[in-house]
């Protein structure tokens, strides 16, 4: 099975400067900002069927590195 | 589910100033990368900047002098000028956002083609 | 800029059979543990539609029959069984840095 895609939430990156838990790496800017900016990815309600409009991250990828997900190395800034 | 919907003149005269709007609904402005793209009638794709969620810019280099990107978030709309048009701005103008963490562009308008002619 | 040169140009592949096609980038797109590496489906008069994301991943809705491989500077878009609705332009794209950058597409028949 495919290994699914990585998260760059706070919770996975290690030290030395990680995002705290409520903020996610923004690749552009290159520092931590609130996750609600970003527009991560909303889980699904419970028993929806059709897939969410959004192709980020599956609901339980959206949280962290969950089971057969990689957490994603985030050093310092550059 | 999030829409966006470009609209602007389709014809423009050489020297004039390009200007669209993009309209978004389904989701805030306030969040995300909000580009714009363009695709040339050889099917050449220019990426061409982008506003944040912050209202910062970024216009790829080659276009810089010539592009401005605004946005009025009581609207929920963003902006596209390109001054000093030339026939070579002929394209088809998508507004586009993309995914987190990928930034992969999943959400496109449909797209407004725009002649630059006298 | 990355440069991202697509091949072949154009390709015709017969119904069932496997279509591939390239993009080489002219620096690495892999950042994080991520490849920063997009494909598009464009069609006549429609907005590319992204097909996979960060090299390897399904877009939403895509079927099962495309699928991307590749890390660094060397990717792939395969295609199979190839089917009637498959005909149309591909793209790829880095968004690994600003200015994100597109190949220059590559054409895809039925033979």
């Known amino acids: 099975m495919r290994r699914g895609p990585r998260s760059l939430r706070g919770r996975d990156a290690p030290a030395p400067t990680p995002c705290v838990p409520a903020e996610c790496f923004d690749l552009l800017v290159r520092h931590c900002v609130a996750c609600g900016l970003l527009r991560t990815p909303r889980p699904k309600p419970a028993g929806a069927s059709s897939p969410a409009p959004r192709t980020a991250l599956q609901p339980q990828e959206s949280v962290g590195a969950g089971a057969g997900e990689a957490a994603l190395p985030l050093p310092g800034l550059l | 589910e999030v829409q966006l919907q470009e609209s602007g003149p389709s014809l423009v005269k050489p020297s004039q100033t390009l200007s669209l709007t993009c309209s978004v609904t389904?989701?805030?402005?306030?969040?995300?990368?909000w580009n714009w793209i363009r695709k040339f009638p050889g099917n050449k794709l220019e990426y061409m900047g982008y506003?944040?969620?912050?209202?910062?810019?970024y216009y790829n280099p080659s276009l810089k002098s010539r592009i401005s990107i605004t946005r009025d978030t009581s609207k929920n709309q963003y902006y596209l000028q390109l001054n000093s048009v030339t026939p070579e701005d002929t394209a088809t103008y998508y507004c586009?956002?993309?995914?987190?963490?990928?930034?992969?562009?999943?959400?496109w308008g449909q797209g407004t083609s725009v002649t630059v002619s006298s | 800029d990355i440069v991202l040169t697509q091949s072949p140009a154009s390709l015709a592949v017969s119904l069932g059979q496997r279509a591939t096609i390239s993009c080489r980038a002219s620096?690495?797109?892999?950042?994080?543990?991520?490849?920063?590496m997009n494909w598009f489906q464009q069609k006549p008069g429609q907005p590319p539609k992204l097909l996979i994301y960060?090299?390897?991943n399904q877009g939403s809705g895509v079927p099962a029959r495309f699928s991307g491989s590749g890390s660094g500077t060397d990717f792939s878009l395969n295609i199979h069984p190839m089917e009637e609705d498959d005909t149309a332009m591909y793209f790829c794209?880095?968004?690994?840095?600003?200015?994100?950058?597109f190949g220059g597409g590559t054409k895809l028949e039925i033979k």
């Open positions: 620096e690495s797109v892999d950042n994080y543990g991520i490849s920063f």
């Open positions: 506003i944040s969620y912050s209202g910062s810019t």
């Open positions: 794209q880095q968004s690994k840095e600003v200015p994100w950058t």
């Open positions: 389904g989701d805030s402005i306030t969040s995300g990368y």
């Open positions: 960060a090299a390897s």
């Open positions: 586009a956002s993309p995914n987190y963490p990928f930034y992969a562009m999943d959400y």
